[in-house]
Interface confidence: medium
């Protein structure tokens, strides 16, 4: 006997009624006296509802089920489940027996929409740039468990410093609490989205935080105007200073260093204590100088990836901030020169001269000239490839037609260090030994 049920799960909202469809094809002359119909939970075999001996035997499932008696004779064995609960979720098997028998299982997927999230801030007043704020996003009474997403005002997903917990209540419905910890910039919008994966229902809320400026004016924070140039592998000091007022103590100081673009925390001093490096353990303050207003940051073993802008936030009673740029540099090696071909050279031959210089940063400027100091710009191809550390290897190729003899010089200039490295080759139109 062929018994048909829907392939896809039946989705039902908590508290509503659901129909679990099941049908069979009655033969001519079929009567209900011949029918045995049993609905049971697939896993536990617990009886849910039955029809036997020509009679509806009623619900064995908390009196919340019913058949469609007027439709049974046409082969409709569907089950109505009333006031759906989370606990009803699962697979139900429909057994039909006339002379032969057949069965099929239908899945019930229970769902409940999440409420619009509420957003809370801690602390929620006297906020200043550089403060660490905990934003909590709470949404209630949903099912199944939610997916939670955060993003900033530019639509960038925020995945770090997020902690999400989901607790089921007595009815099995979930309350979601997601906590985002952020260091405040000048202002910012933070949005939380709670998604019900079954209903594809989105509930979201935003909070915009505008830190207050103190009416008495800001702390003046001073940093160098020019970028700080640091060689790869050396230590760099990002200078930052403020003017402490009489009676100032370190207990009043909040100092935050962060990456200007991404707001990533680099180092902080709060609650009278150095909170340490949040940047690969390569940063340090000058603790003995803080009380005198020296908020400088020491960055050790500088890497190419460190290049960029760092913001120094100082908050006492008032606050102030300033950004300092770090320009990373690495000197280029003395160029090596190669010739191709490198023997049996005659005037009129075309020669390729390659000038190679290694492990510099940033990208080099490459210049060629002949023995008379005349710049050579035609037939020059220069390529610069960065290695895993971000350092560049430079290969510049000059193609020349030989005269009787000639000197060719290549200069590799580091534009930041104003460092010049050069190599020369002298070619005489004689067979080379």
């Amino acid at each position: 006997l062929e018994v048909q049920v829907p392939e896809d799960p039946v989705v039902a909202l908590v508290g509503t009624d659901a129909t679990l469809c099941c049908s069979f094809s009655p033969e001519p002359g079929f009567s209900l006296a011949q029918l045995n119909l049993i609905w049971q939970l697939t896993d536990t075999k617990q009886l849910v509802h039955s029809f036997a001996e020509g009679q509806d035997q009623g619900s064995a499932y908390a009196n919340r089920t019913a058949l469609f008696p007027d439709l049974l004779a046409q082969g409709n064995a569907s089950l109505r489940l009333q006031r759906v609960r989370v606990a009803d979720e699962g697979s139900f098997t429909c057994f039909v027996s006339i002379r032969d028998f057949g069965s099929a299982a239908v899945s019930l997927q229970v769902a409940a929409p999440y409420s619009k999230p509420s957003m809370t801030l801690e602390p929620n007043k006297d906020l200043r740039p550089g403060d660490t704020v905990t934003i909590t996003c709470s949404s209630y009474q949903g099912y199944p468990e939610a997916e939670v997403f955060w993003q900033d005002g530019q639509g960038v997903p925020l995945t770090g410093n997020v902690t999400t917990s989901q607790m089921a209540n007595e009815q099995g419905l979930f309350d979601v609490h997601s906590i985002l910890r952020v260091v405040l910039g000048a202002n910012g919008t933070y949005s939380c989205l709670v998604r019900n994966p079954v209903l594809q229902q989105d509930a979201h809320s935003s909070v915009t935080i505008t830190p207050q400026r103190s009416p008495t004016g800001a702390v003046e924070v001073q940093v160098p105007e020019d970028p700080v140039v640091a060689l790869v592998g050396t230590d760099a000091t990002l200078r930052c200073s403020f003017s402490p007022e009489p009676g100032f103590s370190l207990a009043q100081l909040n100092l935050i260093w962060q990456l200007t673009d991404t707001k990533q925390l680099v180092h902080s001093f709060t609650e009278g204590r150095d909170q340490g490096s949040a940047y690969a353990n390569r940063t340090a303050l000058f603790p003995d100088l803080l009380a005198q207003g020296n908020a400088s940051l020491r960055l050790q073993r500088v890497r190419v990836a460190d290049e960029g802008s760092f913001t120094c936030f100082v908050s006492i009673r008032d606050f102030g901030s300033a950004a300092v740029s770090l320009q990373v540099a690495a000197p280029y090696s003395k160029p090596s020169m190669t010739l191709e071909p490198n023997k049996d050279l005659r005037p009129g031959d075309t020669v390729t001269i390659t000038c190679s210089s290694y492990r510099g940063y940033p990208e080099a400027e490459v210049f060629w000239q002949d023995g008379q100091g005349v710049p050579l710009t035609g037939n020059v191809t220069t390529s610069q490839m960065a290695n895993e550390q971000g350092l560049f290897d430079v290969h510049s190729v000059l193609r020349v037609v030989l005269g009787a003899n000639g000197t060719y010089s290549c200069l590799v200039r580091n534009p930041v260090l104003q460092q010049d490295a050069h190599g020369s080759v002298t070619i005489t139109g004689q067979p080379m030994t």
């Epitope: 997916e147 993003q151 005002g153 639509g155 997903p157 995945t159 989205l193």
Partner: antibody, heavy 121, light 106 residues
């Protein structure tokens, strides 16, 4: 009809800068975040960053930090992407692309026709 | 950064074939999006949020997957489907694209 129309092809020398524009029409410019994606010849797609036209806030791919600047002029519904210190590897087609309307739509539903930038000495 | 690896990098198929391509993420992502690009043209959104069909896209395209493994399927390849297909994620910054799968005529 929603459209993003970009400025024409550019040829630049190494070390120079290029500024590409993207004019939006057929929708409210300030309601969608605008991003920039580039594609080198024969290569895949590379995200550069985006700008929120409502606030002017930007987000950049760290690979381009210090070299890329994104701006907008809301009065003419136009976004701009400027790339400085050009090198030969920056030769590519540059696309502006509109992020989906919902705040949490992390994909691009409308693209400009592309602007070819050639960097050559 | 989350790396997206698409396989195969290219495939040859005939009109009417069922075509499947995969996108593997170096760590778990919430959603994957798919684009189609034809030579000399801008990419076009095909599938968003892993399995939702973008406006105007034929139902022969479908997407599936979760975690780190995602699939784009074309149930019956049509002449206009010969193109390069890219996956994209932004569950974690920065936004990244896969290297692409080129679908060519056999």
């Amino acid at each position: 009809e929603v459209q993003l129309v970009q400025s024409g092809a550019e040829v630049k020398k190494p070390g120079a800068s290029v500024k590409v524009s993207c004019k939006a029409s057929g929708y409210t410019f300030t309601e969608y975040i605008m991003h920039w994606v580039r594609q080198a010849p024969g290569q895949g797609l590379e995200w550069m960053g985006g700008i929120n036209p409502a606030s002017g806030g930007t987000t950049y791919n760290q690979k381009f930090k210090g070299r890329v600047t994104m701006t907008r002029d809301t009065s003419i519904s136009t976004a701009y992407m400027e790339l400085s210190r050009l090198r030969s590897e920056d030769t590519a087609v540059y696309y502006c692309a509109r992020k989906g309307k919902d705040y949490f739509d992390w994909y691009f539903d409308v693209w400009g026709q592309g602007t070819t930038v050639t960097v050559s000495s | 950064d989350i790396q997206l690896t698409q396989s195969p990098s290219s495939l040859s198929a005939s009109v009417g074939d069922r075509v499947t391509m995969t996108c593997s993420a170096s760590s778990s992502v919430s959603y994957m999006h798919w684009y189609q690009q034809k030579p000399g043209k801008a990419p076009k959104l095909l599938i968003y949020d892993t399995s939702k069909l973008a406006s105007g896209v034929p139902s022969r395209f479908s997407g599936s997957g979760s975690g780190t493994d995602f699939t784009l399927t074309i149930s019956s390849l049509q002449p206009e489907d010969f193109a390069t297909y890219y996956c994209q994620q932004w569950s974690s910054a920065p936004l990244t694209f896969g290297g692409g799968t080129k679908v060519e005529i056999k």
